[in-house]
Interface confidence: medium
């Protein structure tokens, strides 16, 4: 999950770009990500107890049909494929609706922050925010982007707590200290 190049000091970063229908703009990682993407748990530090709880799906795990589903009988293929296609279309429509609703909300609120210390236009957000942003909207200021941290698929080596983190219903495994993605 790599993002495009950026200035090392976090200046002159472009405004968020629009996401394709299957993706959501994650303010935490400042990048379009698959809406269902989950983070990997943070390893426990020395002396910690049981391993962090795992969510149902990790980024490195398959999202598609498993081995057990590969041998679907013909009727399954005939009816399953259109059903999946329909579901995908519905999801895409919902996503488009959400994006345009966000855009309207942002316009109504005059969304952009006005204040600016040294830094770029892209900003880290609180942990529990993974929201869809309309294109072209950016904060006027921010710390060096990204905030300290590593790949969006990673949480720090320590204490993980699963919490709902998206507005699309998927659950992200995040931690009390997650600040963001890796530096690019």
């Amino acid at each position: 999950m790599r993002r495009g190049p950026r200035s090392l000091r976090g200046r002159d970063a472009p405004a968020p770009t629009p996401c394709v229908p299957a993706e959501c703009f994650d303010l935490l990682v400042r990048h379009c990500v698959a809406c269902g993407l989950l983070r990997t748990p943070r390893p426990k530090p020395a002396g910690a107890s049981s391993p962090a709880p795992r969510t149902a799906l990790q980024p490195q795990e398959s999202v598609g049909a498993g081995a057990g589903e590969a041998a679907l009988p013909l009727p399954g293929l005939l009816f399953g494929a259109p059903a999946l296609l329909g579901l995908a279309l519905v999801l895409a429509l919902v996503l488009v609706g959400l994006v345009s609703w966000r855009r309207r909300q942002r316009r109504l609120r005059g969304a952009s922050s006005a204040e600016a210390p040294d830094g770029d236009k892209d900003a880290p957000e609180p942990l529990d925010k993974v929201i869809i942003l309309s294109p072209g909207i950016s904060d006027a200021t921010a710390p060096a982007w990204p905030p300290p941290g590593e790949d969006p698929g990673t949480t720090p080596p320590g204490h993980s707590v699963p919490v709902p983190a998206t507005e699309l219903g998927s659950t992200e495994l995040v931690t009390t200290k997650t600040a963001g993605p890796e530096q690019q």
Epitope: R2, T40, P43, S113, G119, P148, E150, D151, K177, E182
Partner: antibody, heavy 116, light 114 residues
Framework: DVQLVESGGGLVQPGGSRKLSCAAS????????MHWVRQAPEKGLEWVAY????????NYADTVKGRFTISRDNPKNTLFLQMTSLRSEDTAMYYC?????????WGQGTSVTVSS | DIVMSQSPSSLTVSVGEKVSMSCKSS????????????LAWYQQKPGQSPKLLIY???TRESGVPDRFAGSGSGTDFTLTISSVKAEDLAVYYC??????????FGGGTKLEIK
């Protein structure tokens, strides 16, 4: 348990080279950025170099730019710092640290002395 | 580069006393977008490597005793130890992670016990 073990330090002559290693265990090394931070005798902490998880972003302190090279071998869970054209002011304890939002975990350090 | 300044450079206290040390940055470490201060505190005991104590200026790292408290915002920060114990003998460093590279540290405050 998260563990970082530095090695490779020792006595080096001015102008000489040395390669430090940091063996990582207890966490998914390939997912985390790493730093080298040094501390001269009786002095404070000085950030030296940073490498992200996939080695696509590398940063150096101005004091070591052009002389030091940070690298990593993810399959071997090892971080490296190749030091060349060493100067007396590079004499320090060198620590590797896991980078998350700050420097979360530190190794015990390896001592480098540059002296003739 | 953001310059970090710590004071005093050293202080001596008795066990049980409350102690505070200061860290100032040359520019704000507070990001208004999330109201977080991009500052960490580390403890380095004699002969040991540094250990993360506090992040986001006031959040204690897991396992750090609650007698350690970070406070402050913007450019002025304080680390307070409410009741010093003998094992708190150490040098304490602040570090900013707001604008980087470079990641910059303060010069440290050496805490000595009477």
């Amino acid at each position: 348990d998260v563990q970082l073990v530095e090695s490779g330090g020792g006595l080096v002559q001015p102008g000489g080279s040395r390669k430090l290693s940091c063996a990582a265990s207890g966490f998914t090394f390939s997912s985390f950025g790493m730093h080298w931070v040094r501390q001269a005798p009786e002095k404070g902490l000085e950030w030296v170099a940073y490498i992200n998880s996939g080695s696509s972003t590398i940063n150096y302190a101005d004091t070591v730019k052009g002389r030091f090279t940070i690298s990593r071998d993810n399959p071997k869970n090892t971080l490296f710092l190749q030091m060349t054209s060493l100067r007396s002011e590079d004499t320090a304890m060198y620590y590797c640290t896991i980078y998350y939002y700050a420097m979360d975990y530190w190794g015990q350090g390896t001592s480098v002395t540059v002296s003739s | 580069d953001i310059v970090m300044s710590q004071s005093p450079s050293s202080l001596t206290v008795s066990v049980g006393e409350k102690v505070s040390m200061s860290c100032k940055s040359s520019q704000t470490l507070l990001y208004s977008g999330n109201q977080k201060n991009y500052l960490a505190w580390y403890q380095q005991k004699p002969g040991q490597s540094p250990k993360l104590l506090i992040y986001w200026a006031s959040t204690r790292e897991s396992g750090v005793p609650d007698r350690f408290a970070g406070s402050g915002s913007g450019t002025d920060f304080t680390l307070t130890i409410s009741s010093v114990k003998a094992e708190d003998l150490a040098v304490y460093y602040c570090q900013q992670y707001y604008i980087y590279p470079p990641w910059t540290f303060g010069g440290g405050t050496k805490l000595e016990i009477k």
